[in-house]
């Protein structure tokens, strides 16, 4: 699986999850997020050669097409597969609000 | 929606579905597929600017991060959203087989 356990431990050129820390205030300008100050959102990148964690029959066929026809511009792309939520604390006036934001952290990638 | 109805009628630089015809014999070497001779598999391509058909909270946040930090290499990618099957005819010996292959035709795209 192209997950954090594998990808963060290996120098992997092809499609894999990469670490990306986002500071809410500095990177997004979100001063309103009280906690956490930032989080590892991570992202997916790297080429998707034939059969690399193909998501659908289309991505397998497209990967094969791209391999057999290298001049082609069409190829699968490395995108998130499994995502996890992030819990944040913010204030509405003086009232603290705890909210779970879905699909905020990339845990693994696929070729789609 | 970034579907064939919209994308095939507009000169759209950003993420959209693009026409791609695959000839089974010429492009894949699949002489064994009797019918059809080929099909429009299509593919997704184009930049994913902030809020362009974002698939998840992560892709929205990543699109915003990428817009505010243009030097960043992390950005969402344009990938298939809706796919349709393709029915093919092939032979096992002299016995014809009709089979529906799932997820073979891209009908729309998203930024993931």
């Amino acid at each position: 699986a192209l997950d954090t356990n594998y990808c963060f431990r290996n120098l992997e050129e092809n499609c894999c999850v990469r670490p990306l820390y986002i500071d809410f205030r500095q990177d997004l300008g979100w001063k309103w997020v009280h906690e956490p100050k930032g989080y590892y959102a991570n992202f997916c990148s790297g080429p998707c050669p034939y059969l690399r964690s193909a998501d659908t029959t289309h991505s397998t066929v497209l990967g094969l097409y791209n391999t057999l026809n290298p001049e082609a511009s069409a190829s699968p792309c490395c995108v998130p597969q499994d995502l996890e939520p992030l819990t944040i604390l913010y204030y509405v006036g003086r009232t603290p609000k705890v909210e779970q934001l879905s699909n905020m952290v990339v845990k693994s990638c696929k070729c789609s | 929606a970034l579907d064939t109805n919209y994308c095939f009628r507009n000169l759209e630089e950003n993420c959209c579905v693009r026409p791609l015809y695959i000839d089974f014999r010429q492009d894949l070497g699949w002489k064994w597929v009797h019918e059809p001779k080929g099909y429009y598999a299509n593919f997704c391509s184009g930049p994913c600017p902030y809020l362009r058909s974002a698939d998840t909270t992560h892709s929205t946040v990543l699109g915003l991060y990428n817009t505010l930090n243009p030097e960043a290499s992390a950005s969402p990618c344009c990938v298939p959203q809706d796919l349709e099957p393709l029915t093919i005819l092939y032979y096992v010996g002299r016995t014809p087989k009709v089979e529906q292959l799932s997820n073979m035709v891209v009908k729309s795209c998203k930024c993931s």
Partner: nanobody, 118 residues
Framework: EVQVVESGGGLVQPGGSLRLSCAAS????????MGWFRQAPGKQRELVAI??????TYADSVKGRFTISRDNAKNTVYLQMDTLKPEDTAVYFC?????????????WGQGTQVTVSS
């Protein structure tokens, strides 16, 4: 279940030759996409060559030295490796991608070791 079995690996001197064989289940071989991949220690698995019907392609690093061929009567795909170099040392894996039928999917062999050393 599709069976994929490699053979033919071994120790060879630089400049030498080896021929790897990969047998796959007869019921799916004729429409399978057959591929050879390799994985060197500490490196990622990489594509070496593909035979897709009557189309074939090679990794740049082996072009002109390796030849993939298939014998549909024997349900076997071969990888003829000539002018071998030390950097060709790796475990070589055969893959069968079956696009149709009840066995649809991709299947891997266990791998065969190729060592190029003097």
């Amino acid at each position: 279940e599709v069976q994929v079995v490699e053979s033919g690996g071994g120790l060879v001197q630089p400049g030498g030759s080896l021929r790897l064989s990969c047998a796959a289940s007869a019921s799916v071989f004729s429409w399978s996409v057959m591929g050879w991949f390799r994985q060197a220690p500490g490196k990622q698995r990489e594509l070496v060559a593909i035979s897709s019907g009557d189309r074939e392609t090679y990794a740049d690093s082996v072009k002109g030295r390796f030849t993939i061929s298939r014998d549909n009567a024997k349900n076997t795909v071969y990888l003829q490796m000539d002018t071998l170099k030390p950097e060709d040392t790796a475990v070589y894996f055969c893959n069968a991608y079956v696009p149709v039928g009840e066995s649809r999917g991709d299947y891997w062999g266990q791998g065969t070791q190729v060592t190029v050393s003097s």
